[in-house]
Amino acid sequence: EPPTACREKQYLINSQCCSLCQPGQKLVSDCTEFTETECLPCGESEFLDTWNRETRCHQHKYCDPNLGLRVQQKGTSETDTICTCEEGLHCTSESCESCVPHRSCLPGFGVKQIATGVSDTICEPCPVGFFSNVSSAFEKCRPWTSCETKDLVVQQAGTNKTDVVCGPQDRQR
């Protein structure tokens, strides 16, 4: 059977299959039976990232420093600008429209994964044998002190928030 539709990079207009404009260009005029689709490159700070028939290019995203944003990758005529967050902040969404400070892991919790510009701190509870006595965005759970290696004995048991307290061994005669 003959094609009843246009080819992949074409669109139907006035009974003609016209070529779409390639990424980075916008549509100025549709083709006719005897003229070609007319496309023009997007201007400075504009882009189109697909084969299209758009008459206007999209504006590049603005990375607003007042929202804690900075440019991670400058946009081109075919790609949008990619924003990320300043040091100590991370994006609130996948599209990274604003930033919030990284959260700290409370005592009893340690950092499992340090935050990046696009992801928050991931905390984990300190397991038995480990503790964290600070609120921190960087510190992992630390192991309890090993009293034995210091030739000492445990005088006070450790918790997930406190280290063990070591003391001298009782010498009995």
């Epitope: 059977e1 003959p2 094609p3 246009c6 080819r7 992949e8 990079k9 074409q10 139907l12 009974s15 003609q16 299959c17 016209c18 070529s19 779409l20 404009c21 390639q22 039976e33 070609e36 689709t37 496309c39």
Partner: antibody
């Protein structure tokens, strides 16, 4: 304006290969399928097949399958047609032609000037 | 494959004559039928698409008709530039096929 400019005439020995180029200008190359047509001396037109310049996909007439390769380089808007294991009866003019689709029909609206390939020992 | 049979394969005519070339498809191709003119040493040139649509810039002495399996190209008043070869082509299904051509010579 749309132009399809083909490479120059070639003389080849039997068993050799030949690669004909077709450089497109004046339109979006990836937007239209390119076809190849063969015409032996004093003979009629014979459709060989098409290439989708965007994906590189091809479709051949059965008698050209296996011995004919169609490729493209989108960076320079050029389609290529290669015939391997040439025989003397492959002597012909090869044309590239652009496909145009409307809702009433499909046709070739622009043709290259043709490339004569002579196969002779 | 769809066979396209053109007739006659050659003919002699005079300037001013009315000329009719026929093309028969081996199966129904609706109106997916084109006519091309080819001058010696040149690439073919589209005259008519979709059986009857005259291409812009082509003289009005050319006309096409037909649908299904039987098609006709008519030249109402032959001019000196028309003494060339004409081909029909079906684009209903691949492989796209051409008629064997009709060579028009001066009587």
């Amino acid at each position: 304006q749309v132009q399809l400019v083909q490479s120059g005439a070639e003389v080849k020995k039997p068993g050799a290969s030949v690669k004909v180029s077709c450089k497109a200008s004046g339109y979006t190359f990836a937007g239209y399928y390119m076809h190849w047509v063969r015409q032996a001396p004093g003979q009629g037109l014979e459709w060989m097949g098409w290439i989708n310049p965007d994906s590189g996909g091809t479709n051949f007439a059965q008698q050209f399958q296996g011995r004919v390769t169609m490729t493209r380089d989108t960076s320079i808007s050029t389609a290529y047609m290669e015939v391997s294991r040439l025989r003397s009866d492959d002597t012909a003019v090869f044309y590239c032609a652009r496909e145009k689709i409307t809702m009433t029909g499909i046709y070739f609206d622009y043709w290259g000037q043709g490339t004569l390939v002579t196969v002779s020992s | 494959d769809i066979q396209m049979t053109q007739s006659p394969s050659s003919l002699s005519a005079s300037v001013g004559d009315i000329l009719t070339i026929t093309c028969r498809a081996s199966q129904n191709i609706t109106t997916y039928l084109n006519w091309y003119q080819q001058k010696p040493g040149k690439a073919p040139n589209l005259l008519i698409s979709a059986a009857s649509r005259l291409r812009s810039g082509v003289p009005s002495r050319f006309s096409g008709s037909g649908s299904g399996t039987d098609f006709t190209l008519t030249i109402s008043s032959l001019q000196p530039v028309d003494f060339t070869t004409f081909y029909c082509q079906q684009t209903f299904t691949t492989p796209w096929t051409f008629g064997q051509g009709t060579k028009v010579e001066i009587k």
